[in-house]
Interface confidence: low
């Protein structure tokens, strides 16, 4: 930000009424009135270029320092070219000297050169040559010097002419302040610029109304430089929850809008399924029946639990059931739907029911399912099963009601036995099988049916209580179709699939395990 100048002395603005002291009195410097753009202007002028050694002083009035530490002196002046005078005016100069003196009181007309300290020799960038002067072209020079630190109550400036043709049109003395500033929603007070060039005064800012330093952020600070410019901003303030930045201030969110945390972002419109918010809202309340999960951002619409799975089927396959369902028609506005499957079994004879999680096996864990199907196995035959599929989402835990669909299935058969060929010879086949342990207690006997492949007219049956059998008196090098079926008190269980097993040829005789 640009420095603010506080003017202590302005000759040009004073309209010739400052009454500066000239020394020697009545010689050298003289106050002249002129007209510029039809306005009277005043200047202190001296032009004793032909008179040999000159030592003409012009002293300002006493200037009260106030709070200034370093002052800046801006001079506007013209200097005529010494060559524009007859014979080049051998004693003519083209510079003058600038002095200052500090004091705690006004000495009035008591002028003492020895009290003054030289600031600098002032030389023009451009001199007014004859042709310019005759044509009334002005060559206005602007020079600035600074002095500091000042410590007394006030000071004088003085101009020493040593034989130049000079007109002082403007003498302006000022000090600099870093102006009051609003930056980064922080207010920095007007601050007097320091006097030492390398130093930067650190100034703490205060957050504007309804602004805060963000958590973990730095407090706002700026540095006021000697030239009155603010430099090196550190930290910032952000509009607090419920407020947004409008120009250099924090303004409450309008009704129907909200902001849930201190940030640079603007207020957001209340999302779907929320009630209209009041002014300055930090969040928008959910409509009745709609909820916000703890981890849901305030910008997300309010949601509700899903409806039940739309369509549920249970397809029995022996001692297995495949459950399939479609997603709920109403997701509740969320995508985090999961499914839970629970199982209940009922004995047909007694009508007694109970949970069956412990006795069945699921193809994947039945809680937190994301897929829409699961296979349940190890079901007992001649048992009624009821499966419940519940749909849940991130807000289901906020309500007591549940969204589920059920499907029932009766298991009438045992699961088909899994059959293996244990060994073979030219005239025999050794076969074994297995069924799930829960079903084994219900099996009375196993029936093994076998026949030659391609012979549909005759087949053989063997019954056994065990889990294996050797089929003898078979023809060598012949393929037999073998099927095993469990027999229960209620009737036949599911048959295994038909397996093709081949006896050995005479050349490859001897028992061979497969």
């Amino acid at each position: 930000a640009q420095g603010k100048e506080v003017v202590l002395l302005d000759f040009a603005a004073a309209g010739g009424e400052l009454g500066w002291l000239t020394h020697p009195y009545g010689k050298g410097w003289d106050l002249m009135q002129n007209i510029m753009n039809d306005m009277p202007i005043y200047m202190y002028s001296v032009c004793n270029v032909m008179s040999g050694d000159q030592d003409n002083w012009l002293r300002t009035n006493w200037v009260y320092r106030g709070e200034a530490e370093r002052i800046f002196i801006e001079l506007k002046f013209t200097v005529r070219d010494c060559n524009s005078f007859p014979g080049g005016a051998s004693s003519c100069k083209e510079t003058f000297n600038l002095y200052y003196a500090e004091s705690d009181l006004d000495y009035g007309t008591n002028f003492q050169k020895r009290l003054f300290t030289k600031i600098d020799t002032i030389a023009p960038d451009e001199i007014t040559v004859s042709s310019d002067f005759e044509a009334r072209h002005v060559k206005l020079n602007v020079e600035e010097r600074s002095v500091g630190p000042l410590t007394r109550k006030g000071f004088y400036l003085a101009f020493q002419d040593i034989g130049a043709c000079v007109a002082l049109l403007s003498v302006r003395v000022y000090y600099k302040k870093c102006p009051e500033l609003l930056q980064g929603l922080a207010h920095f007070p007007e601050t007097i610029a320091g006097s030492d060039a390398p130093s930067l005064a650190t100034v703490a800012g205060t957050c504007v109304d309804h602004a805060v330093v963000p958590p973990g952020g730095e407090e706002p600070r700026m540095h006021c430089a000697v030239d009155g410019e603010w430099l090196v901003p550190i930290g910032q303030c952000l509009c607090q929850a419920g407020y947004e930045k409008v120009e250099d201030a924090c303004q409450a969110c309008s009704p129907g809008f909200f902001k849930f945390e201190a940030s640079e972002s603007p207020c957001l419109e209340c999302p779907e399924h929320t009630l209209p918010s009041p002014e300055g809202a930090t969040s928008c309340e959910c409509e009745e029946g709609f909820f916000r999960a703890p981890q849901d951002p305030a910008s997300m619409p309010c949601t509700r639990p899903p409806s039940a799975p739309h369509y549920l089927t249970a397809v029995g396959m022996g001692a297995k059931v495949e459950l399939r369902w479609t997603p709920p028609q109403d997701s509740g506005g969320r995508e985090d739907i999961v499914y839970s499957v629970t199982c209940e079994q009922c004995w047909p004879e007694s009508g007694e029911c109970g949970p069956c999680e412990a006795s069945v096996r699921y193809s994947e864990p039945p809680h937190g399912l994301t897929r829409t199907s699961v296979t349940v196995s190890d079901l007992e035959p001649h048992m009624n099963y009821t499966f419940t599929v519940e749909a849940r989402n991130g807000v289901s835990g906020l309500v007591t009601s549940r969204s589920f669909r059920t499907a029932s299935v009766s298991i009438n058969q045992t699961e088909p036995p899994k059959v293996r060929l244990e060994g073979r010879s030219t005239t025999s086949l050794s076969v074994s099988w297995s069924i799930p342990p829960p079903q084994q207690s219900r099996v009375w006997k196993y029936e093994v049916t076998y026949r030659k492949k391609g012979d549909s007219n005759s087949y053989n049956v063997r019954r056994t209580e065990g889990f294996s059998v050797t089929l003898d008196d078979l023809a060598p090098d012949t393929t037999y179709l073998v099927q095993v079926q469990a027999l229960t008190q209620e009737g036949q269980g599911a048959g295994s699939k038909v397996h093709e097993f081949q006896t050995l040829s005479p050349e490859g005789s001897g028992n061979l395990a497969v």
Partner: antibody
């Protein structure tokens, strides 16, 4: 060659209005301050008004203040004087005059506000 | 306003004469003074500015002097073309007032 040519004069009744024009040529009009100077029959010269090179500032003699308005159109190299509420004592030959605009500041010298160039004049007669 | 007073108001002179016209200001005007020549039915012409500076094209027989409140216009050798009315004008103040004029006639 510098030329200033006034027009718009004539006979007008007291309380009436006239607009004088001054067409300039032969110099850079926009660099010059311009003025109107009048001369009543058989009398001396009286400065009336002036205008800066770019249209401001403007100044008026006390005798015409509030009634006369000076203006210029640099694109047309023309100076104007709008005269309202005319009185018998406004009867005069009105001269358009031009003078070098000078510069912002002149050290120990005055502004060049004398009249270097004059028009031939236009007669304004205010009579009932 | 600054008042400008010329004297004499008229004078008679012969060709070749040296003629001096005086102009007094009611207050100091430094050297901000111009002289004009006007012939009957014609516009004024600038002769001298800044009290003593001859305007371009003006014959050197015309000269001006003075500062503060007293100024003079001198015609060192009157020529037939010089019979006219002469006006002084100050340009230190806004109003740029003119003197009442001095008429130079043939004797």
């Amino acid at each position: 060659e510098v030329q200033l040519l006034e027009s718009g004069g004539g006979l007008v009744q007291p309380g009436g209005s006239l607009r004088l024009s001054c067409a300039a040529s032969g110099f850079t009009f926009s660099h010059y301050m311009m003025a109107w100077v009048r001369q009543a029959p058989g009398k001396g010269l009286e400065w009336v008004s002036r205008i800066g090179p770019s249209g401001g500032p403007t100044h008026y003699a006390d005798s015409v203040k509030g009634r006369f308005t000076i203006s210029r159109d640099n694109s047309k190299n023309t100076l104007y004087l709008q005269m309202n509420s005319l009185r018998a004592e406004d009867t005069a030959v009105y001269y358009c005059a031009g003078y070098d605009s000078g510069y912002d500041y002149v050290a120990v010298a005055g502004p060049a506000e004398y009249f270097q160039h004059w028009g031939q004049g236009t007669l304004v007669t205010v009579s009932s | 306003d600054i008042q400008m007073t010329q004297s004499p108001s008229s004078l008679s002179a012969s060709v070749g004469d040296r003629v001096t016209i005086t102009c007094r200001a009611s207050q100091s005007i430094s050297t901000w003074l111009a002289w004009y020549q006007q012939k009957p039915g014609k516009a004024p012409k600038l002769l001298i500015y800044k009290a003593s500076n001859l305007h371009t094209g003006v014959p050197s027989r015309f000269s001006g002097s003075g500062s503060g409140t007293e100024f003079t216009l001198t015609i060192s050798g009157l020529q037939p073309d010089d019979f006219a009315t002469y006006y002084c004008q100050q340009y230190q103040s806004y109003s740029r007032t003119f003197g009442q004029g001095t008429k130079v006639e043939i004797k």
